[in-house]
Amino acid sequence: RQQWELQGDRRCQSQLERANLRPCEQHLMQKIQRDEDSYGRDPYSPSQDPYSPSQDPDRRDPYSPSPYDRRGAGSSQHQERCCNELNEFENNQRCMCEALQQIMENQSDRLQGRQQEQQFKRELRNLPQQCGLRAPQRCDLEVESGGRDRY
């Protein structure tokens, strides 16, 4: 790869490390769970295992009264915070893609089945536009099986 690309990747990585993408993850999960609610499915089956602070201590999240509040209160708050974070990547489409990939990876082991994964992916692709930002043209959101190691 070109040297300038590698240097850009390092700077992108620095931004990704500093970004708080939790509000994006929460906003999207609430969104797809609301959609499922309207089809009569309970998003809070015991297998759902929503985030707790102790599970993800490097992403302190002061905003959420309860994980993925199913009434949707606070979802617009999550979306606003999410958009503020994504705005940092507006002028670097490759880095925007990496931010979306990281959101996908962080949530991949919480998505129940292929259908929910596809729905999450679809909403994730639309996220930049929802924020009034340019969406990256080519962005592979497939999660490799090795990308699910979580501490």
Partner: antibody
């Protein structure tokens, strides 16, 4: 809370290799790069290179090219730095640091090279 | 490689006074795509690993007292410690992570006068 715990002190003979480990906890290991930095006694900080736990990609300072190898084992959230063909000049404290900007550091591993 | 040059090499400041450390980079470390300067400041006390104080030139790391501040852009940067405390005695390093190899300044030793 975030912790980086490094392996213990090492004494090596010239020409030998040393492998230092850095066990991470309290965060999503794959999301943050690991940097390795060394410091000889009474000297400043010297950046050696970086490694991405997610991809395994690495980048090394020219000075260490061909002599250093940075790897990771994501199943145990551990990064490794191996330095070969040691000389007395390599005697130093070796640090791992989390993140491109060095947000958190390990306690350091003293490596002494002596015949 | 980007060379980071700190000044002074050592500095003596009285308790409660202001300490100012300068760092110059041999080329700009401002990324125009996001308007961020990729420079950090570290504090190191004897026998301890370095501690991050400031990243992106002026963003204070969480838990760092607000008497520490960073400023500057492009090639010239400053770390300021207002109202110096006894526990601030240490060596301070600037660090660029704009391009590899990442590089540190030579360090500034801060002592009480």
């Amino acid at each position: 809370q975030v912790q980086l715990v490094q392996s213990g002190a090492e004494v090596k003979k010239p020409g030998a290799s040393v492998k230092v480990s850095c066990r991470a906890s309290g965060y999503i290991f794959r999301n943050f790069d690991i940097n390795w930095v060394r410091q000889a006694t009474g000297q400043g900080l010297e950046w050696m290179g970086w490694m991405s736990p997610k991809s395994g990609d690495t980048g090394y300072a020219q000075k260490f090219q061909g002599r250093v190898t940075m790897t990771r084992d994501t199943s145990i959230n551990t990064a490794y730095m191996e330095l070969s063909s040691l000389t007395s000049e390599d005697s130093a404290v070796y640090y791992c640091a989390r993140g491109v900007d060095g947000t958190n550091w390990g306690q350091g591993t003293r490596v002494t090279v002596s015949s | 490689d980007i060379v980071m040059t700190q000044s002074p090499d050592s500095l003596g400041v009285s308790l409660g006074e202001r300490a100012t450390i300068s760092c110059k980079s041999s080329q700009s470390i401002l990324d125009n795509s996001n308007n961020k300067n990729f420079i950090a400041w570290f504090q190191q006390k004897p026998g301890q690993p370095p501690k991050l104080l400031i990243y992106w030139a002026s963003a204070r790391e969480s838990g760092v007292p607000d008497r520490f501040s960073g400023s500057g852009s492009g090639t010239e940067f400053t770390l300021t410690i207002n109202s110096l405390q006894a526990e601030d005695v240490a060596v301070y390093y600037c660090y660029q992570y704009y391009s590899t190899p990442h590089t540190f300044g030579q360090g500034t030793k801060l002592d009480l006068r």
